[in-house]
Every structure is written in structure tokens, then in C-alpha cells.
Interface confidence: medium
């Protein structure tokens, strides 16, 4: 499919001008290659009329130009002094005319309307309101006022001052007679339909002395605005319908066959299933404007979209509308990343989020899409060191692997974590992407103690058991904080006995805290990674208390570290299960933390053992394909 995009149909009137914009992927080659506008012949072929290399056909001499805008990936063809001879099928394209890197455009030039003298022309958008003004003389002040529409050869009464309203206009028309000082009556028609277009006659009086005034009403279907976006990217439709519909239900619909327009989203709570998790209708402003954001663009999202206002929340005749033609460029600059990541309850996921690599310094965000009302996406974490309180200890946004990708790790998964999440930055809004997290049945691979109590001044050893499937991975321990997870020294204690049917390649890796202080309290993660791509993690909360009598829980843990046999493992360890997870909210409440911030230092924390690199990662379900 050609990545070139432009208007499918262009309509104009003799003597007028048109401006045709064609879009192309702004690669270096495309920016500099030849751009052309050609007319398609009856027997195939396409005869160049104008090109970016300076050629202008004699037919276009003095009335056309072609301008390339390489920074936008567009070029514009302007044609003036149109005649009906200009009607036909054209192509705008790149390179050689016959190569197929082009888009078909149909240009229709019609004759201007043949209007009677003294005809007042009213040009109004579909769905809007028109006021037709009708002057009269004093002698007709007390006489019947009326408005007729010319249907074929006959004038048909639309409305009159005696109270008649034509059924086609019921509920949307009124006749106003101005105060005695003004010799004028006006007819106001709301919710204009295409069928309302035509020639009208207003009349005051019914005899030979009546005053008459001709009016020509042109109802314009909105020309669609062309929108060119990348596959997997994001689009925002800004819809400004005017303050008169501020309190009317709003909708965005996509035209299917014929005149049908299937609702994508509306303010009455309807949302098309195909857009679940990837659409938001931003709250409407007092002037009636609103915007719709769609992320994770797919090929099948291409098409014509209309936004409008109607009490039913869907397109009806007379709805004021705005239109867009969306083209989804499959030669996308946005890399493929998994749209679904699966995680086991009690375990973790690591989500890779793409961003525009030119904007490495932008703030990265991760938010949870909520479908209620019109959709919203409350923030969970950002790259400045903000983490939502309920996610303390189990969520981290890492700048690794960098160069156009950041990583989000979420552990201690429960069924409540299933849903759609958005990756965003405060830079290029086209790079918003969506990932769905699904929680599946299974056992976490990493085994850690359920919870650990350390004693002030003593040494604590916390074990983490890695199955043999992770033998080739780097294993680490780190301490979580709101800016990341700082790497800590750990000891490989040899093979683990925590796994049945697992050979010498399984591993027990311990974290040792010497001379425990109050500052050691908090969340610790053990995990696996390969380079800058992160896999599974498990979290342990270490509480710190004053010295007690012998036999406290951490002693048995220390024993378990030294000689992990089945008996001690049963008492000292648990595989993290859905219902047994230490809920980080409890700790947040205990410590009265409103939200987790490092006020003293907003800088990112390091994770890599002994290095200044920042943590990053990949889900274990899709690692090392990078």
C-alpha cells in the first residue's frame, strides 16, 4: 500500500482556486526526491502538470504552483482560475509517475449557481443555524409574512406568520417579526440539513403590492481535515462545535458503508469495543469543544471520522459536525513493542515503552487507563521520581535501555492489575502507546521470603531462589525507592534446593545487610536481567525492630540461607501468592506516606551493580528480541 496520502475528492466552483496537500513519510530520501502532480489519462499513464523540479505544463502556466514542506512531510499544489475542463482524476506522488508512490485525487469543478438579481447568498455549515432576513415596506407591515422554497418549478410554503410550519422543518424553524421601528422579518432555521439547500423566496403580503426577496441557501458538508499518523502511534481529534451545543451530548464516529457512522465514543458513555483501552474523550470546555485521543493506531483505524453534537450521542440529520480523513502510515517510525504482556499472579511484568529517541530528556510517564465515563488515565509513575502511594515498593520506571525505549517494572501482581496502561512522554504526543497487562495462572519463578524482620545492629541475610531456566541471566538484588532500585552486593550461595526437577543450574543468591540500621527498612527486589533488558522480579519488605529474645523470624531465615532444606524452606519461605502478598498500601499507611518522593535529590538512581547506568528492562515473556 502506498504511504502517500491526500484528499480523495476536491470540489470547487469555476473561477475559484484549490489548495491540495499531499503527505509522505518524511524520510531523508523522500524529503529530497521529486514531487509531482499529474492527470490520469483514459488509457492509463499520468501526464505531469507540475513538479517540484520546476516543470509547469502550458495548461497550468501562470495559475499553479507546487511547494514542498520537507520538515512536515507534505507538499502543496495550488491551482487558480479553475474551469470545468480541470475536472478529472489526478495523482500526487513522489519519484517517477509510474512507480506507484502516489495517491489518487478526484477534482470536480462545477458551474457557479445561476442566481436571480438581488439574490442574497447564505453559505452555512451543515448542522448550523441560518437567519434569512426579509425586508418589507410599511404598507405590508400588517400583512402575512411567508417563506417559500423553490422545489422544481413550484414554490412550496415553508413557514408563515399565521403559524404554519412545513413538516420538514418542524421543531427547527421560527419566524421573527422585528419591532415596529424595523421593517424586517427574519426566518431562523436550526440544525441545517443538506436537503435544506436551495432557492428561497420571502414575501410580505399576498397581492400585487407584496414585497419579495430571493435567497440562495448553500449548506456545506465539512471538508475533511487530512490527518496522517504512524502505525502504532497516536492521534488527537480536536472538535470545536461552538458554544450553542455546549450542553448537547458529543460523539466521535467512523463512517462505514454509505451514510452509516458507527460511534467510536460519546459523552453518554458509549465506546466501541475495538477502541477499549486506547481511547480517551477529554472533558469538554465551556465553549463546547472537546478532544479525543486514540493510541496504538492500527491499519483498520484508517478512514473518515466525524465528531458532532446530538442529544442521542450519535450522528443524526442536522447534527453540527467536523470531519477528518485519517491515514495510518504503515512505514512507521514507532517500533513494534508487545501490545499484551502476561504476568503470573504474585510475580511481575516488565513493559518496554517506546519514545521518540530525539527526546531522550523528556519526562516519561506511565498511567492506567480507566474506562469509566469518557475514559481517563491517572498517572502511576514518572521519570522524575513520582510514584503513586498505592504502588510503593512494587513499581519502577527505568530509563534503560534508553535510545528510544524505557522500561516499567510492576511486581506483586494481583488480578486487580489486569488492564490497559499507557506509555507517554511530555514531548511528542504521537508516541503514546498502549499495553494490556493480563494476569495468568501459574507459579512465580523466583522464590523469596514472605516478609522479613531485621534486628537493629545485627546482620540479615535474605535469600532469593532462581530456577535453572534463569541460569544464563544476571541475578541481582536492589533496594527500591521512588527513583528506581539501587543495586546492592549479593552472594551466590550455589545451587538452590527449592525446586523439584531442577539441576545444578538453579541458584540461591542472598542479600546481606550488615549492622542493620533503621535506614535499611523498606522494599528489596531480587530479579534477573540480560544487559539492559529486565526480566522477572520478586519483592520482599524488610522491617527493622529492636533486639528481642532469640528465636525471632529472621534467625530461621538465616538458617535457611545456610542450609536450605525442605523443612526450613516450608517454614521460612513462601512462593508469593495472590492472596498472601504484602500489600504495599499497608506500609504506606503505617508510615503516613502521601506519595513517595525523594525531595532532596530528584536525580535518577542507579541499579546496575557498581555502575552509573540506569535500570531498564523487558518482560520475561518477550525478552532479548531487541
Amino acid at each position: 500500500k502506498s504511504p502517500i496520502f491526500g484528499p480523495e475528492e476536491v470540489n470547487s466552483v469555476e473561477g475559484n482556486s484549490v489548495s491540495i496537500t499531499c503527505y509522505y513519510p518524511p524520510t531523508s530520501v523522500n524529503r529530497h526526491t521529486r514531487k509531482y502532480w499529474c492527470r490520469q489519462g483514459a488509457r492509463g499513464g499520468c501526464i505531469t502538470l507540475i513538479s517540484s523540479e520546476g516543470y509547469v505544463s502550458s495548461k497550468y502556466a501562470g495559475r499553479a504552483n507546487l511547494t514542498n514542506f520537507p520538515e512536515n512531510g507534505t507538499f502543496v499544489v495550488n491551482i487558480a482560475q479553475l474551469s470545468q475542463d480541470d475536472s478529472g482524476r489526478y495523482k500526487c506522488g513522489l519519484g517517477i509517475n509510474s512507480r506507484g508512490l502516489s495517491f489518487d485525487v478526484s477534482l470536480e469543478v462545477s458551474q457557479g449557481p445561476g442566481l436571480l438579481n438581488d439574490t442574497k447568498v447564505y453559505t452555512v455549515d451543515l448542522g448550523r443555524t441560518v437567519t434569512i432576513n426579509c425586508p418589507f415596506k410599511t404598507e405590508n407591515a400588517q400583512k402575512r409574512k411567508s417563506l417559500y422554497k423553490q422545489i422544481g418549478l413550484y414554490p412550496v410554503l415553508v413557514i408563515d406568520s399565521s403559524g404554519y410550519v412545513n413538516p420538514n422543518y418542524t421543531g427547527r424553524i421560527r419566524l421573527d417579526i422585528q419591532g415596529t421601528g424595523q421593517l424586517l422579518f427574519s426566518v431562523v432555521i436550526n440544525q441545517l440539513r443538506l436537503s435544506d439547500a436551495g432557492q428561497y423566496l420571502c414575501q410580505a403580503g399576498d397581492d400585487s403590492n407584496s414585497n419579495k426577496k430571493n435567497a440562495d441557501l448553500q449548506v456545506l458538508k465539512p471538508e475533511p481535515e487530512l490527518v496522517y499518523e504512524d502505525l502504532r502511534g497516536s492521534v488527537t481529534f480536536h472538535c470545536a462545535l461552538g458554544p450553542e451545543v455546549a450542553n448537547v451530548a458529543k460523539f466521535l464516529c467512523r463512517q462505514s458503508s454509505g451514510e452509516n457512522c458507527d460511534v467510536v465514543v460519546n459523552t453518554l458513555g458509549k465506546r466501541a469495543p475495538a477502541f477499549e483501552g486506547r481511547i480517551l474523550l477529554n472533558p469538554q470546555d465551556k465553549d463546547g469543544s472537546f478532544s479525543v485521543v486514540i493510541t496504538g493506531l492500527r491499519k483498520e483505524d484508517a478512514g473518515r471520522y466525524l465528531c458532532g453534537a446530538h442529544s442521542d450521542g450519535q450522528l443524526q440529520e442536522g447534527s453540527p459536525i467536523q470531519a477528518w480523513q485519517l491515514f495510518v502510515n504503515e512505514e512507521s517510525t514507532i517500533p513494534r513493542s508487545p501490545t499484551v504482556v502476561k504476568g503470573v499472579a504474585g510475580s511481575s511484568v516488565a513493559v518496554l515503552c517506546p519514545y521518540n529517541r530525539k527526546e531522550s530528556k523528556s519526562i516519561k510517564y506511565w498511567c492506567l487507563w480507566e474506562g469509566a465515563q469518557n475514559g481517563r488515565c491517572p498517572l502511576l509513575v514518572d521519570s522524575e521520581g513520582w510514584v503513586k502511594a498505592q504502588y510503593e515498593g512494587r513499581l519502577s520506571l527505568l530509563e534503560e535501555p534508553g535510545n528510544g525505549t524505557f522500561t516499567v517494572i510492576l511486581n506483586q501482581l494481583t488480578s486487580r492489575d489486569a488492564g490497559f496502561y499507557w506509555c507517554l512522554t511530555n514531548g511528542d504526543t504521537l508516541w503514546r502507546t498502549t499495553v494490556e497487562i493480563k494476569i495468568i495462572e501459574g507459579e512465580p519463578n523466583l522464590k523469596v521470603p514472605g516478609n522479613v524482620t531485621a534486628v537493629l545492629g545485627e546482620t540479615l541475610k535474605v535469600p532469593c531462589h532462581f530456577p535453572c531456566k534463569f541460569s544464563s541471566y544476571e541475578k541481582y538484588w536492589c533496594k527500591w525507592n521512588n527513583t528506581g532500585c539501587q543495586a546492592l552486593p549479593s552472594q551466590d550461595e550455589g545451587p538452590s534446593k527449592a525446586f523439584v526437577n531442577c539441576d545444578e543450574n538453579s541458584r540461591l543468591v542472598s542479600l546481606t545487610l550488615n549492622l542493620v540500621t533503621r535506614a535499611d527498612e523498606g522494599w528489596y527486589w531480587c530479579g534477573v536481567k540480560q544487559g539492559h533488558f529486565y526480566g522477572e522480579t520478586a519483592a520482599v519488605y524488610v522491617a527493622v525492630e529492636e533486639r528481642k529474645a532469640a528465636g525471632s523470624r529472621d534467625v530461621s531465615l538465616a538458617k535457611a540461607d545456610a542450609a536450605p532444606d525442605e523443612k526450613v524452606l516450608d517454614s521460612g519461605f513462601r512462593e508469593i501468592e495472590n492472596k498472601a502478598i504484602q500489600d504495599p498500601r499497608l506500609f504506606a499507611e503505617e508510615k503516613a506516606v502521601a506519595d513517595t518522593r525523594d525531595q532532596a535529590d530528584g536525580s535518577r538512581a542507579s541499579v546496575d551493580s557498581g555502575s552509573s547506568e540506569e535500570q531498564g528492562g523487558s518482560s520475561r515473556h518477550h525478552h532479548h528480541h531487541h
Partner: nanobody, 127 residues
Framework: EVQLVESGGGLVQAGGSLRLSCAAS????????MGWFRQAPGKEREFVAA????????YYADSVKGRFTISRDNAKNTVTLQMNSLKPEDTAVYYC????????????????????WGQGTQVTVSS
């Protein structure tokens, strides 16, 4: 509840500078994005500038880009708008606003997105 008090407004010649300050009290100031808006007589309130909680993200209206700078000091619970190269069309009442942290989709440029507002300070630029 967050209370916001603006100061620093006044009369200045075109081309001159002013520094507006907004002092916040009440709930955790440091967790809230902050914005400046302005309203000229007979006009709608319009966005001027906004700043994220840590100061890492700043956003400006096109009309003030390059002339105005927004900054914040979380230790002092203040947000500042440094206004240089002032023009007569900058004349307005300037309001400081704060919002609860939630949704990064829209970048805090609409007045409806803000939860708390100051009383405003008058800035008049004479030609």
C-alpha cells in the same frame, strides 16, 4: 485544601520586566503541577505557563514563549513567573493555579484542569 496567594504585579513600561510570585500553603505543594493563567478585560481566562511537580517539565503559551520563565522552589512552596520584554497585550490579571496530580494526557493548559486558584494580581504594561 491548597491556598494560593499571588504577588509582584504592578505597572511597567513596554519592554520592561516583572516577577510574579505565588505562595502556596495547605496540602503538599510539592506534589502538584502549577500553572499561571491571565485574564484581560472582556476576554476569557487564558493559559500562560505550567510546571510539573519537580520543575522538570515546563509548558508555555506560544504568545509568551521565550519571554516568560516559570520556575518553582518546593522548599519554599513558591512558584515564580519571570516576565521579560513585556508588551501592552500582556496587560491582565494573572492567576496562579494548582492541580491534584492525576492525568498526564492533557498537559495542564486548560483552566478546567486546575483545582485551586489564587485571587489574582494585576499586571499593566503601558506603551
Amino acid at each position: 485544601e491548597v491556598q494560593l496567594v499571588e504577588s509582584g504585579g504592578g505597572l511597567v513600561q513596554a519592554g520592561g520586566s516583572l516577577r510574579l510570585s505565588c505562595a502556596a500553603s495547605g496540602r503538599t505543594f510539592s506534589s502538584n503541577p502549577m500553572g499561571w493563567f491571565r485574564q484581560a478585560p472582556g476576554k476569557e481566562r487564558e493559559f500562560v505557563a505550567a510546571i510539573s511537580w519537580s520543575g522538570g517539565g515546563t509548558y508555555y503559551a506560544d504568545s509568551v514563549k521565550g519571554r516568560f520563565t516559570i520556575s518553582r522552589d518546593n522548599a519554599k512552596n513558591t512558584v515564580t513567573l519571570q516576565m521579560n520584554s513585556l508588551k501592552p497585550e500582556d496587560t491582565a490579571v494573572y492567576y496562579c493555579a494548582s492541580r491534584d496530580y492525576s492525568d498526564p494526557i492533557s498537559l495542564w493548559v486548560e483552566d478546567r484542569e486546575y483545582d485551586y486558584w489564587g485571587q489574582g494580581t494585576q499586571v499593566t504594561v503601558s506603551s
